[in-house]
Interface confidence: medium
């Protein structure tokens, strides 16, 4: 069985992984990539494209961050002038940031509701 994937004549498009099977091979999309419209996933003519999670809205970035598309994935970076909250690293999918100017701001006494806290955050945003 010739391993077509390592024979020096790589048969797959550069957007795919070559997977050797007995007597044949497959060209599968790389993780975080998807077949271009109309292209199947597997045959030697497979062509894939990097899923842009940011543009397509398939990301989980917090509103305090900006989504950045990376190859096969995405990351969430603090908005300019903001910093990661409580030692959470920047540039991760779960990054949450806070405004450096108002990092000590707290809701008025007695406000414990998550919804109200978010409301005050929005009011504070409007005041900027």
């Amino acid at each position: 069985d010739v391993n077509e994937c390592t024979s020096g004549q790589n048969p797959c498009h550069s957007s795919t992984h070559c997977l050797n099977n007995v007597g044949s091979y497959q060209c599968r999309c790389r993780p975080g990539w998807q077949p271009i419209p109309g292209s199947p996933n597997g045959p030697n003519n497979t062509v894939c494209e990097d899923v842009d999670e940011c543009s397509s809205g398939q990301h989980q970035c917090d509103s305090s961050t900006v989504c950045f598309n990376t190859v096969g994935s995405y990351s969430c970076r603090c908005r300019p002038g903001w910093k990661p909250r409580h030692g959470i690293p920047n540039n991760q999918k779960d990054t949450v940031c806070e405004d450096m100017t108002f990092s000590t701001w707290t809701p008025p006494p007695g406000v414990h509701s998550q919804t109200l806290s978010r409301f005050f955050d929005k009011v504070q945003d409007l005041g900027r």
């Epitope: 550069s14 957007s15 062509v47 894939c48 494209e49 990097d50 950045f68 990376t70 190859v71 096969g72």
Partner: antibody, heavy 119, light 107 residues
Amino acid sequence: DVKLVESGGGLVKLGGSLKFSCAASGFTFSSYYMSWVRQTPEKRLELVAAININGGSTYYPDTVKGRFTISRDNAKNTLYLQMSSLKSEDTALYYCAGHGGLRLPFEYWGQGTTLTVSS
Amino acid sequence: DIVMTQSHKFMSTSVGDRVSITCKASQNVGTSVAWYQQKPGHSPKLLIYWASTRHTGVPDRFTGSGSGTDFSLTISSVQSEDLTDYFCQQYSSYPLTFGGGTKLEIK
């Protein structure tokens, strides 16, 4: 046999304009992202413009933004680069290059066309 | 912008030798690195992509390795036609950027 043939190079005065063309054959041009990459006299390679498959999205680094315009005509299998307000630092060998996706390497390269900007 | 640094502008070698050309990225680029060979008077030619995948028709004496920020291109047994320029490139994020090049020359 894949071919990318650039044309339109020449000597231009400082502040002048020029348009390059790149004729493609031997591959499905309309399925490839295309770019212009220049090589300076010191041999440094620099991406100057990129365009997606249908021409609807383009990219320019800050060094050429507002001065260079990349476009393509898939019916004619041709890529273009319109350059204006040319500076001496634009002097280079310009290659047209094809890549299979936004973030994929340059698989196909032309032979290059030279731009010399003189004062 | 991501800066790709090829610390050796020139490397001396002999035919039959094993040689490694290195490239360092200023930030993590995963495995989104390609290597190109450029002979005098010719355009660059893709050798390696995804840091270690050989492009179609590239001889198996060329091997790429690395991930993150440190990458290398190794030629297991240098042939006379390999004595030329090599460039690394990252395609993790725009602007796509290249290293300054390494010229492989005879000792």
